[in-house]
Structures are given as C-alpha cells and as structure tokens.
C-alpha cells in the first residue's frame, strides 16, 4: 500500500521514513537474480560506505522487491545528504543510486482514531486521534475524509478536508449578537428552546473543520445520520517534507438527532434551576441528561459526563397539546449548559437527540404577566401591565393578542421594548378576549415566551356610553 503512495516518486530506489528516526528503502527488479545478488550501500559525507541488510519479496508477474530497513537509529540523520547506491555482487554494475535527505522523505503512519462522537451542537462531530509518533505530530498536517454511511448507497458523497490547526473549535456563538437586536424587538431567535422550523445554511454539505493537536471538530453534518471517517497525515512541508501517508482504518459514528425534532424547550425561572420539556413519543420512554462546560474550544482528551436530569410527572394540560416529558436540574451561571434526550422505543432501540448549548441567562422564562384594562371611550381601551421582573424591565418585550368572541383567529400586537402599557381600538358593542405574554430579549438576558395570561374578557360599551 505504501508503495502506491510513492507512485509519484520517479526514483527507481524509493525511500520513506515513518517517524524521521527510521528509514526504509526499496526497489524492484524484473530479472530473476539469486538471493544475495544485491547490496544496498549508503554513506553520509566523508564517511565510509556501509551495507544495509536486505530482505526480498517475490512479486507475482513482476520480479522481486528488495527492501532495506536501516538497522540503527543512529544511521538515520536529518539535514545531511545520504548517498545510496545498489551494487550487484555478481556483475560489475551499479543498479541505481540516489542522494536524499531523510527529512524530505516522510511517509507518516496513519493516525489511529481513538474516539469519534457527537459534538456539543447538533450536526457536530468531535474526533480525537493518537499519533503513532507523538514526537513529530507538531510537524504534520492532517486530512480527514468522511461521508454518510448509507448501506443502500455505498457511493455517497465523500468530503475530504484539510484540518486547520490554526484555530481551535469554534467558540460557542451567543445567539444574540448586535445584528439580532436590530430586528424587531421580539424577533424569534434561533435558540435551543425554540421549537419552530430549523434554520439551516443553504447547504448542509459544506461543513467546517477545526483542530487542535489530536482532536478536531466537524460541523455542518446532518443530525441523526451515520458517518464513516478516516484520517491521514503528511509532513508540513516547512520543517519536514514527504508525502501523504495512508488513510487510517475507517471509523463509523452515529450522530445524535437534533432535539428540535422533539420540540425541546429549556428555561429557568430563577437563574438557578433549569426545566427542560419535550414532546413525549408514542410507545417510547425518554430520559433527559445534562452537563456543564466552561470550555470555549475543543476539549482535548476530555469527554463529557452526562448527568441525569431529574424527571417530573408527565403533563397534559390540554387535549390539543401533545404530552410533554419534563425534567429539571440545578445549574450554574458560569458555564454552558448541554442537553441530551434519549428516547427508548419499544424494541429497546435508543435514539439520542442533542439540544443546542446555552447559557442560563439565555433561557430565562418570565412569569406570566398580569393584564389590566379600562375603557376610556367606546371601543378605546387603555392597557397596563406590571413588568414580571423589574430587574430586566428594559430587556422585556411583550406580545398582546386579541380575538372577537366566536372567532378563531388572533390578532397579535408587539408593543415597543420596555413599554408598560398601551392603547387599543376595538369595535364598540363587541366582546373580545385579550391575552398578554412576555419574554426577555436584551443584551444581558434572553429566553422563551412566558405562557399567555389567562384570557381577559372585554365587552366594549355602546358609542354613547362615554
């Protein structure tokens, strides 16, 4: 296999080094010579030639491959020209010769992938590997190839990407950047507790790679899919030179699904305890897990220990809404929260679903606000509400919805950020239901919508009443 990797090497005498502390040279002979016909001699400048012990391998339909592995590490020196020549013992001929630098003929052994598992975000994959020669790992660059493992389609798309060592894993993006605040104050963020449609980039095939030493994070994969992956390495071309080594044996990994599919929502009411809920699946049991991480980049050789999220009684508040599973745990405000839901189906198959990580201050759910009203004139209402959390008044936005009695459709209004009330024009002599909800959406705190307030029934007066 290694021979094919050296195919571009036009030299008849091919040499490679696995670790830059070893050297193997070989060449092929078509003619049927006796064993012991050839000597591979080598010499460094101003030194006496020495013979390298040869072994031979018969090659069907071709001839013989002669191989020499340099016997002594001390004979393998970097940055000095090494003169090699093949001498025929029986005939007066030098079969081939070349001068090389050991530091330019690297052919690294493939790294062994020791772990491949889902990363901290849906569609991420964390891999780590061991370098057979750790002392040279700083002088190697790595290439990863991977693709979906589809038994029906063995020729699925294969992605080959150079692993960039300059950066670590992408730091967790806080969902609310400045640009998010330029939108309407209550614009729906892409958050871990959102159960709306998943926002994806135009192409999920274009995936990103980053690495640090022996670990790497791939993103942009399809959650819930299986993938195979392989690694190989080559000298960096700066300190050491050579060729790409062979690919490692393929490793397969099943990525957890995206918990958005389960409608996962997590929130805190008190910045201490976190509650998560998700839709209960038919004929299946489920369990939530969590862990906290401080890491802003790839944890090297560190894999999370998932803790049990304490289960709550299943709720079914209304016949229209699906049944939810709920669990809760104590959290911290100095670390990122990761959520995993495991669904076990009746035959015992376990499916994992990963939520998008979040900080506790990104999942603050406000209590349901109280709505007060009075009719100023016929159909003209003045509305007022208390901020559920005075400490975050300027970061609280509201939605008011109302509907005429007997109607199904609701009209939704969004008062300005931080408003404590407003006015509403309704038809006189009509009956309405009004509801209010609140959520945090500022630079410090964010979170999901509170539940709607209990419907407030309003019957507007006739036009002569006021």
């Amino acid at each position: 296999q290694d021979v094919s990797l050296l195919a571009s090497d036009s030299e008849p005498l091919k040499c490679f080094s696995r670790t830059f502390e070893d050297l193997t040279c070989f060449w092929d002979e078509e003619e049927a010579a006796p064993s012991g016909t050839y000597q591979l001699l080598y010499a460094y400048p101003r030194e006496k030639p020495r013979a390298c012990p040869l072994s031979s391998q018969s090659m069907p339909h071709f001839g013989t491959r002669y191989v020499c592995q340099f016997p002594d590490q001390e004979e393998v020196r970097l940055f000095f020209p090494l003169h090699l020549w093949v001498k025929n013992v029986f005939l007066n001929q030098t079969r081939t010769q070349r001068v090389l630098f050991v530091d330019s003929v690297g052919l690294p052994a493939p790294p062994s992938i020791i772990k491949a598992m889902g990363g901290s975000q849906p569609g991420e994959l964390q891999i780590s590997w061991e370098e057979p020669a750790p002392e040279i790992s700083d002088f190697l660059r790595y290439e990863l190839r991977y693709g979906p493992r589809d038994p029906k389609n063995s020729t699925g798309p294969t992605v080959i990407q150079l692993i960039a060592t300059e950066t670590c894993c992408p730091a967790l993006q806080r969902p609310h950047s400045a640009s998010a605040l330029d939108q309407s104050p209550c614009a729906q963020p892409t958050m871990p507790w959102q159960d709306g449609p998943k926002q994806t980039s135009p192409s999920r095939e274009a995936s990103a790679l980053t690495a640090e030493g022996g670990s790497c994070l791939i993103s942009g994969l399809q959650p819930g899919n299986s993938y195979w992956l392989q690694l190989r390495s080559e000298p960096d071309g700066i300190s050491l030179g050579g060729s790409w080594g062979s690919w490692s044996l393929p490793v397969t990994v099943d990525l957890p699904g995206d918990a958005v599919a389960l409608g996962l929502q997590c929130f805190t009411l008190d910045l201490k305890n976190v509650t998560c809920q998700w839709q209960q699946q038919d004929h299946a049991s489920s369990q939530g897990f969590f862990y906290h991480s401080r890491a802003r980049c790839c944890p090297r050789d560190r894999y999370p220990i998932w803790e049990n999220c304490e289960e709550e009684e299943k709720t079914n508040p209304g016949l229209q809404t699906p049944q939810f599973s709920r669990c809760h745990f104590k959290s911290r405000n100095d670390s990122i929260i990761h959520i995993l839901v495991e669904v076990t189906t009746a035959p015992g198959t376990v499916h994992s679903y990963l939520g998008s990580p979040f900080w506790i201050h990104q999942a603050v759910r406000l209590p349901t606000p109280n709505l007060h009203w009075r009719e100023i004139s016929s159909g003209h209402l003045e509305l007022e509400w208390q901020h559920p959390s005075s400490w975050a008044a300027q970061e609280t936005c509201y939605q008011l919805r109302y509907t005429g009695e007997g109607h199904q459709d609701w009209k939704v209004l969004e008062p300005p950020l931080g408003a404590r009330g407003g006015t509403l024009e309704l038809r006189p002599r009509s009956r309405y239901r009004l509801q209010l909800r609140a959520r945090l959406n500022g630079p410090t705190y964010q979170g999901p919508w509170s539940s709607w307030s209990d419907p407030t029934r309003v019957e507007t007066a006739t036009e002569t009443a006021w």
């Epitope: 003619e31 049927a32 010579a33 006796p34 064993s35 012991g36 016909t37 018969s58 013989t64 013992v89 029986f90 005939l91 007066n92 001929q93």
Partner: antibody, heavy 118, light 106 residues
Framework: DVQLQESGPGLVKPSQSLSLTCTVT?????????WNWIRQFPGNKLEWMGY???????SYNPSLKSRNSITRDTSKNQFFLQLNSVTTEDTATYYC???????????WGQGTSVTVSS | DIQMTQSSSSFSVSLGDRVTITCMAS??????LAWYQQKPGNAPRLLIS???SLETGVPSRFSGSGSGKDYTLSITSLQTEDVGTYYC?????????FGGGTKLEI
Amino acid sequence: DVQLQESGPGLVKPSQSLSLTCTVTGYSITSDYTWNWIRQFPGNKLEWMGYITYSGSTSYNPSLKSRNSITRDTSKNQFFLQLNSVTTEDTATYYCARLGRRYTMDYWGQGTSVTVSS
Amino acid sequence: DIQMTQSSSSFSVSLGDRVTITCMASEDIYIRLAWYQQKPGNAPRLLISAATSLETGVPSRFSGSGSGKDYTLSITSLQTEDVGTYYCQQYWSSPWTFGGGTKLEI
C-alpha cells in the same frame, strides 16, 4: 569469444592439497562477471564449489567445510581452486565456468579429471 | 540447502517424440531455475534461464515452464542431437544446487 581452460594434476594423493587453474581468454576477469568452480562426480552428480567475483570477493559451498579456497592472479587473467585434505571422495571432473548476465553458467571449460588415490 | 529432484534418471525415447522432464525443488525458488544439457565427454551447456528464457542459439523445440517448486523442460519433437543428460539447477539460494540429471536414450 570467451574461453575457459582448466589445468592441474590428474592424480592427487589422499590428505594432500589439490590445486587447479582456470585460464580465461577473451575477457578480463576483473572487468565483470563471477567466476565459478563446479565438479562432477563419477556418478554424474554436479556440485557447485564456490566463486570469485570480478571485484575479488568469494563465496563457498558450506559442504566443503572450509577445505577450499578460490584466489586469482589478475595479471595472468587466471583464477584458482585449492582443495585441502582431499580424500577419494574428491575424485571428479572439475569445471570452471562463468556466471553470466542471467546468473547462470553460460560459459564452461572442457573440464579436467582428477583422481585421488594413493 | 535446497534439494533438487529429477524424478526420472533416464528415459527411453524415440525420435520425433514429445519429451517432458520434471524437476522439483524442496522449497520455492522463485523461477531461479536453469536447465543444462550435457553430452558424453563434454561440459554442460546452458539451455534455459529463469525457468522459461531460452538462451541464444538454443532450438525453439526446447521450452521451460513452472514456478514455485515445480518446473518442466519440454522438447516438442526429439532430434538425434538432443540425446544426452539434462540437469536442472537452482540459483535462488546459496549454495546453488543441481538435480541428479535425466538421461535421454534412443
């Protein structure tokens, strides 16, 4: 054309040494190739005894238990076989031959018959 | 040492016959096999190298085949001048060794 010619005593006493000469004409033994001694016993069995290469390195058949030695005289373009402590078992026809490009004996002398007897 | 065995020490043949002489090595010799012909009172003459390669000047009725441990010399239509003893020789591993010979007699 390359020619090889063996010469030496036809009769040798047991325990003595046997010395044979191979004279090569038409090619310099130091230029190239490997120069061999082979013997054929009365029952026609052939045995390779050893060689000397163009560069002067030698190799021997271990069955002769270090009794033989191959040397050369480059000025005369000759190479020699010396077999020590001979016994009647060493009675044979002795050939010199050249190992050619294909590592086979492509040129042979006509052979010299040696009898070991008291 | 590698032993070379020629199973038939002699053959009684007729002119025009197809003759096959076999040679077996005690281990794989990777086609490092030569065939020699020797006529009475003469030195051996090289016929074939590397199991199958015919030497210059050798009639095309001679051919060699085989690999691994088993090798064959074939003469398609025996001529009078082909009478003699045929030897195989391995040159894979030192010491180089010969077969016991196969004598062809009319």
